[in-house]
């Protein structure tokens, strides 16, 4: 099966790599603009230069293109705990990330929030914290994992998942409650 090509891709595929079809004259192939620049005017004819201009401050193009406008630089989202790793340049968008000992949680493809890596108190580190994944903890006996923290089995209610892990403790508590003095 032939993949469906959009109009722009169809137009571009007729020209050799690094060139695009002139929008008003499909017999002319114009040279694309370098990254960091955008298309100001199409080339007037074959073998003639495309008029490319450098992106203005606050905008960029990261690859060769024939865009009429540069793309706006992304802003790091302070409300999500993001920090700027590297600032925007004419040929590269802003790079946002998290502080040391934090990881990224992606709520959607293009939205992440920074959270502190778990320290595994009352447990051991099974897998260290990574850029996009929290620490994986293994809890000590008498503790169970809840929201990636090791919580005492004394906080385990019968209705919760922790009952299997905390079964001996729950039985002990139940036994203590049941054994009344006569």
């Amino acid at each position: 099966l032939v993949p469906h090509l959009g109009d722009r891709e169809k137009r571009d595929s007729v020209c050799p790599q690094g060139k695009y079809i002139h929008p008003q004259n499909n017999s002319i192939c114009c040279t694309k603009c370098h990254k960091g620049t955008y298309l100001y005017n199409d080339c007037p004819g074959p073998g003639q230069d495309t008029d490319c201009r450098e992106c203005e401050s606050g905008s960029f193009t990261a690859s060769e293109n024939h865009l009429r406008h540069c793309l706006s630089c992304s802003k790091c989202r302070k409300e999500m705990g993001q920090v700027e790793i590297s600032s925007c340049t004419v040929d590269r968008d802003t790079v946002c990330g998290c502080r040391k000992n934090q990881y990224r949680h992606y709520w959607s493809e293009n939205l992440f929030q920074c959270f502190n890596c778990s320290l595994c108190l009352n447990g051991t580190v099974h897998l260290s914290c990574q850029e996009k994944q929290n620490t994986v903890c293994t809890c000590h006996a008498g503790f169970f994992l809840r929201e990636n923290e090791c919580v005492s089995c004394s906080n385990c209610k019968k209705s919760l998942e922790c009952t299997k892990l905390c079964l001996p403790q729950i039985e002990n508590v139940k036994g203590t409650e049941d054994s009344g003095t006569t």
Partner: nanobody
Framework: EVQLLESGGGLIQPGGSLRLSCAAS????????MVWVRQAPGKGLEWVSH????????YYADPVKGRFTISRDNSRNTLYLQMNSLRSEDTAVYYC????????????RGQGTLVTVSS
């Protein structure tokens, strides 16, 4: 006790508009970034939009960009979601929530309001 109470949902025809509200109490509303998430039938929770404490910075997920507007009134402790040009794929239960701080789960989320977009 933190309470979040959504309202404004209902049955609406494609192309129509709705305004959802979320009344907040039990915490300092003006200190928190607020979020709208939704859950379509048989699907997981989807981030829709959020707004920072002062209402300056907003975010919209791609499927709702240009159609939905999030706002807040800190004097009334209320969060809003204006939904225009509604589509059948917007059918979901809409929840308002406080932006999580400790980890990727919602400690404080409302009971939700159902939005059904159908002709």
């Amino acid at each position: 006790e933190v309470q979040l109470l959504e309202s404004g949902g209902g049955l609406i025809q494609p192309g129509g508009s709705l305004r959802l509200s979320c009344a907040a109490s039990g915490f300092t509303f003006a200190h928190e970034t607020m979020v709208w998430v939704r859950q379509a039938p048989g699907k997981g929770l989807e981030w829709v939009s959020h707004i920072d404490r002062v209402g300056q910075d907003t975010y919209y997920a791609d499927p709702v960009k240009g159609r939905f507007t999030i706002s807040r009134d800190n004097s009334r402790n209320t969060l809003y979601l204006q939904m225009n040009s509604l589509r059948s794929e917007d059918t979901a239960v809409y929840y308002c929530a406080v932006l999580p701080k400790r980890g990727p789960w919602f400690d404080y989320r409302g009971q939700g309001t159902l939005v059904t977009v159908s002709s």
